[in-house]
């Protein structure tokens, strides 16, 4: 029995496997910073994790998803203040007892070295130098992301 998140992920993957021409984001919108194929927006107000998630959604974006350690380092290089923490799109799934990205995938244990406990109501934040487990109710800043894609982007199965 698949969860609703898993079903959604399957649907998304199936639609990606079709040959499509879809409109995309050629350049980062004003106030968004380009990092490779993404646009990032660093908030300067604070919110608990859930509100941060909702804010990114209103901006037609998502909380930051980090693919690997290299992307983490490049993101951290954009953080100019050592003392500031930012929410990303990763929290602890109690039912699966694992860190889960908001796109439904699980954290590869080698990707991030998390300081703190993996437990209920824990969400992940990043600073200039580290990755932390924090209570999701903690009010800190957050990072939203938009994917940069070519305007004419033909997608082929298994490409």
């Amino acid at each position: 029995q698949k969860s609703s998140i898993e079903k959604c992920s399957v649907d998304i993957q199936q639609s990606r496997n079709k040959t499509t021409e879809r409109p995309g984001l050629l350049n980062c919108p004003i106030y968004w910073q380009q990092l490779r194929e993404k646009c990032l927006l660093f908030s300067h107000t604070v919110n608990p994790w859930n509100n941060s998630l909702a804010d990114c959604s209103t901006k037609e974006s998502s909380l930051l998803l980090i693919r690997d350690k290299d992307e983490l380092i490049h993101t951290q290089n954009l953080i100019r203040d050592k003392a500031i923490l930012f929410w990303i799109g990763l929290n602890f799934s109690l039912s699966e007892k694992n860190w889960k990205w908001i796109n439904g995938s699980f954290l590869n244990s080698n990707d991030l070295e998390i300081r703190g406990d993996a437990k209920e109501n824990s969400c992940i934040s990043i600073s200039q130098t580290s990755v932390y487990s924090e209570y999701c109710s903690t009010e800190i800043r957050w990072i939203c992301q938009k994917e940069l894609t070519p305007v004419r982007n033909k997608v082929y199965p298994d490409s």
Epitope: I30, Y31, Q33, L41, F42, H44, E60, R80, D81
Partner: antibody, heavy 116, light 107 residues
Framework: QVQLQESGPGLVKPSETLSLTCTVS????????WSWIRQTPGKGLEWIGY???????NYNPSLKSRVTISVDTSKNQFSLRLSSVTAADTAVYYC??????????WGQGTLVTVSS | EIVLTQSPGTLSLSPGERATLSCRAS???????LAWYQQKPGQAPRLLIY???SRATGIPDRFSGSGSGTDFTLTISRLEPEDFAVYYC????????FGGGTKVEIK
């Protein structure tokens, strides 16, 4: 309460560079976007550009070739430089805290006249 | 660039009356990224509304914003003497541009 104060010469000669500084008090300049806006009787309010730390800046396309905005976090200040000025650049110049697109705190404004 | 046209240019009303100010965009404003400001002579503009309808901190509830796409409205439900001023709309969905302003004067 965040307060902003513009400072700089009130008179600039044509073809020279206009330089203004905005000092922020009552809060840290770090982690926020900061903008310059000007107001003329002819063109009304016109956004000039913003700075975010020193990693990101963006300028009004119509002024982009002449504008530089910089920040000095140690002094809690940010600055505007507008080169090759003409009489059309005569305006009241405001600095403001930029909430990624709208402006919640403004300086009181400083009149800059371009004249020989 | 998105051009914002405000109407009317001048609105002559009495205290206690309702003021309706219009701001029309030359193209759709993304995500209702529109703000309203009040400016009095010799002062800087003051933020009233952002996101088309959210009141800024400390702004009385007689000020309300509405609209989406290309048509936006600022309503002052009951004019107080201190509300007579010039009002500007500003979009921040695509670069940043301001409207030409509407002057609300005492009739």
């Amino acid at each position: 309460q965040v307060q902003l104060q513009e400072s700089g010469p009130g008179l600039v000669k044509p073809s020279e560079t206009l330089s203004l500084t905005c000092t922020v008090s009552g809060g840290s300049i770090s982690g926020y976007y900061w903008s310059w806006i000007r107001q003329t009787p002819g063109k009304g309010l016109e956004w000039i550009g913003y700075i975010y730390y020193s990693v990101s800046s963006n300028y009004n396309p119509s002024l982009k070739s002449r504008v530089t905005i910089s920040v000095d976090t140690s002094k809690n200040q940010f600055s505007l430089r507008l080169s090759s000025v003409t009489a059309a650049d005569t305006a009241v110049y405001y600095c403001a805290r930029d909430e990624t697109g709208y402006f919640d705190y403004w300086g009181q404004g400083t009149l800059v006249t371009v004249s020989s | 660039e998105i051009v914002l046209t405000q109407s009317p240019g001048t609105l002559s009303l009495s205290p206690g009356e309702r003021a309706t100010l219009s701001c029309r965009a030359s193209q759709s404003v993304r995500s209702s990224y529109l703000a309203w400001y009040q400016q009095k002579p010799g002062q800087a503009p003051r933020l009233l509304i952002y996101g088309a309808s959210s009141r800024a901190t400390g702004i009385p509830d007689r000020f309300s914003g509405s609209g989406s796409g290309t048509d936006f409205t600022l309503t002052i439900s009951r004019l107080e003497p201190e509300d007579f001023a010039v009002y500007y709309c500003q979009q921040y969905g695509s670069s940043l541009t301001f409207g030409g302003g509407t002057k609300v004067e005492i009739k």
